[in-house]
């Protein structure tokens, strides 16, 4: 058997036989192009693609269209993946889309998605979300039916306020909805009464920004 | 520091009338969208009514509309809830809350009155109507 060169995702690398969590290459669907990203092998089994990681403030996530669309920031630690490419994967296969969150208190809570995907630039990245269940509340955070990307000059939320320059951070934003895992990162002791913190509503509630997130994708069939 | 003391809850019987206020310090009421919400035991908190003073428009939850009436003061900082034709359905912990001003929906400019849209939060007051 001819061992695979290319992957993907991170269920594709880790079915060959690397296990073992890091940074690993990816190919773009249908072409050459290569991107790369954090596998997480541990969690739930493994085989998990991080398209989107907080930790400590270390990047700044007010970024443009472009950026967002790309990719920005480390792989080993904040980063986004880039919407280009996970739209890409995600309208080829069925995804689930597991969300994991910390607060400053060391609670840790989690969202399943067990339907994800992000619909192509021609429609701002529009995300598409079913079937939630998880620790982070009994409601979506991410309003629900999903919403279009907004960024700080593309502005395509269902506000007249300009959502991402108001909260900071590009995010599927409603008007402006229940949650912002690309705002502002506020430390311990400066983090409630935030308006434009990493929130997730039907966790924290309103104005408590998180201390970590993480946001990871998985074939359904894996 | 951004602080909201709500008052003016109580035990009331069905079709009497209640005024509840929210008394703001530490920021101006134009600055700010004020919101009124209640929680019931075992249910999400939801919004009753807000304003907005800077321009003075307001939006009411269908089950409240023609009977709770949201009003400011803004010389002595205070948000009121006049609510008339109460039922017993409108037994619930009534929290004040104050958020960003200027989120109106595209499209309809009604103004935004989500709990998840509003930052700062009062302690609540009991409002609990008997039939």
């Known amino acids: 058997k001819e061992e695979q060169t290319t992957f993907r995702d991170c269920a594709e690398i880790f079915k060959s036989g690397l296990t073992t969590s890091g940074i690993y290459t990816l190919t773009f669907p249908n072409s050459t192009e290569e991107i790369k990203a954090y596998c997480d092998m541990d969690v739930g089994g493994g085989g998990w693609t991080v398209i989107q990681h907080r930790e400590d403030g270390s990047v700044d996530f007010q970024r443009t269209w472009k950026e967002y669309k790309e990719g920005f920031g480390s792989p080993l630690g904040e980063y986004w993946l880039g919407n280009e490419f996970v739209s890409q994967l995600t309208g080829q296969h069925r995804y689930v889309l597991k969300i994991q969150l910390k607060d400053w208190e060391g609670n840790e809570a989690h969202s399943l998605y067990d339907h994800f995907y992000l619909a192509g630039e021609e429609s701002n990245y529009r995300i598409h979300l079913t079937g939630l269940t998880g620790t982070a509340g009994k409601i979506s955070s991410i309003s629900q039916p999903g919403s279009d990307f907004s960024t700080k000059d593309s502005d395509n939320d269902k506000c007249i306020c300009k959502c991402s320059q108001m909260l900071s951070g590009g995010w599927w934003f409603d008007a402006c909805g229940p949650s912002n895992l690309n705002g502002q990162y506020y430390p311990q002791k400066q983090n409630t009464n935030k308006f434009n913190g990493i929130k997730w509503y039907y966790w924290k509630g309103s104005g408590y920004s998180l201390k970590a997130t993480t946001m990871m994708i998985r074939p359904a069939d894996f | 520091e951004v602080q909201l003391v709500e008052s003016g809850g109580g035990l009331v019987q069905a079709g009497g009338s209640l005024r509840l206020s929210c008394a703001a310090s530490g920021f101006t009421l134009d600055d700010y969208a004020i919101g009124w919400f209640r929680q019931a035991p075992g249910k999400e908190r939801e919004g009753v009514s807000c304003i907005s003073s800077s321009d003075g428009s307001t939006t009411y939850a269908d089950s409240v509309k023609g009977r709770f009436t949201v009003s400011s003061d803004n010389a002595k900082n205070t948000v009121y809830l006049q609510m008339n034709s109460l039922k017993p359905e409108d037994t619930a912990v009534y929290y004040c809350?104050?958020?960003?001003?200027?989120?109106?929906?595209?499209?309809?400019?009604?103004?935004?009155?989500?709990?998840?849209?509003?930052?700062?939060w009062g302690q609540g007051t009991q409002v609990t109507v008997s039939s």
């Open positions: 809350a104050a958020g960003l001003r200027g989120r109106y929906y595209r499209g309809t400019y009604s103004l935004v009155c989500a709990p998840y849209e509003y930052d700062f």
